[in-house]
């Protein structure tokens, strides 16, 4: 009976605080008045005072909004004592899991990525890989799952779809034939990273692709 299932609390809660989360209850309260307390990081040790307990009702209280990216899980201990201070239960583990909200945008690891590829290569040739990170959870939710896309290509010669990007790995590849260094020596791609697996917040960066020379022209006299 002296057990509490893991408690899930969304981060960035708006209150009002204190917010009652769950009730600690010992069945020894049938015999004697019970006083409840909690200990551990987030209660009586840093970060202090995030959680409290109503000492006679046993209600576990949240005092402020939580931030999953700061602390994703709290491990507290619940205690129950009688009026004379004698412990009536073994300390009980209380796990508080902070559930994720999509409160961070993706961030590219660089503002500008640079890569190169030989002119005249076949479609499917890999050019470079770009990377964006998102502090949100990507295991239990899609909040931190990033999808990559190409927003624009400059110049648009010989046409505007010379490259593609793998939506999950960020690998940029050649998709069309016709790369010709003598005509276009460099492409600038505006790339996007969007969280929620493509349905959330978007951030942009630039990928510069240098077209390397191949010995494809005979000398002119």
């Amino acid at each position: 009976d002296w057990v509490v299932a893991p408690i899930s609390v969304p981060e960035n809660g708006k209150g009002p605080f204190p917010q009652r989360l769950n009730q600690l209850k010992s069945n020894k309260d049938r015999d004697t008045k019970i006083f409840y307390s909690i200990t551990g990081p987030g209660a009586d040790s840093p970060p202090e005072g995030v959680f409290a307990v109503e000492k006679e009702t046993g209600w576990l209280l949240l005092n402020k909004p939580l931030d999953r990216e700061e602390i994703a899980k709290y491990e507290l201990f619940g205690h129950a004592v009688s009026e004379n201070g004698a412990s009536v239960e073994d300390p009980m583990n209380i796990s508080i899991i902070v559930t994720d909200q999509n409160d961070h945008k993706p961030k590219f690891t660089q503002d500008t990525f640079r890569g190169s590829v030989l002119e005249g290569v076949l479609p499917g040739t890999s050019v470079m890989q770009v990377t964006a990170t998102d502090e949100d959870d990507a295991i239990y939710t899609y909040n931190g799952v990033v999808a990559y896309s190409i927003h624009s290509q400059e110049p648009k010669d010989p046409h505007d779809l010379m490259f593609t990007i793998h939506r999950s790995t960020g690998t940029i590849s050649v998709i069309s034939s016709g790369l010709d260094r003598e005509k276009v020596p460099e492409y600038t791609l505006t790339i996007q990273a969007t969280d929620m697996d493509g349905d959330g917040s978007t951030t942009t960066a630039v990928a510069v692709v240098e077209i390397l020379d191949a010995n494809d022209n005979a000398p002119m006299f």
Epitope: G15, P16, F17, P18, R20, Q23, K25, D44, P47, E48, G49, V50, A52, E54, K55, E56, T57, W59, L61, N63, K64
Partner: antibody
Amino acid sequence: QVQLQESGPGLVKPSETLSLTCTVSGGSISGYYWSWIRQSPGKGLEWIGYIYYSANTNYNPSLKSRVTISVDTSKNQFSLKLSSVTAADTAVYYCSRGGSGSYWAFDIWGQGTMVTVSS
Amino acid sequence: DIVMTQSPLSLPVTPGEPASISCRSSQSLMYSYGYNYLDWYLQKPGQSPQLLIYLGSNRASGVPDRFSGSGSGTDFTLKISRVEAEDVGIYYCMQALQTPPTFGQGTKVEIK
């Protein structure tokens, strides 16, 4: 025996900021909810807001835009600031401790300090 | 906000006789396992309020056992089994369920 003592000016001019301090003696400020409550003839007893010892605050929505409560654990004190006061803020201001049985249950009160808002 | 309504607003009493004050809330103050988040305070003349009863029926430390609290949900009662002269003052109920806590308008108890 925990005791609370309010201090601060008894007269504040309209549009200025009311500032009061509550000193906690005979016990620690840790582990409790410390509130400010005021009492005026017109509105009766009105809860203003609280601070938990680790600096988490919560204010009455009707006063939220004007209230700041802060704590100095090293001095065992907590303070109230109420900005842009008007005559309607004239009242006896009490500091109190909550959190013994339920988190409100104000079990210890200061003796109160009368604050008049007048030019 | 939860509105608290007390009655009567004035209560003349005779020492040694019982007295009763009613308090009604605009919504239920019960919150699991039978806990009612309703507190009673007494403000004696010239003093600050003092906690009498918390969680509906629990006497605060040092409060004489002639004071008792009862009720559940939205209707609550404070009873004084035998009024003493020192019991005069204004009695307030307060809901402690939700932020902001709110007080009743007070019941003035005075000796006849």
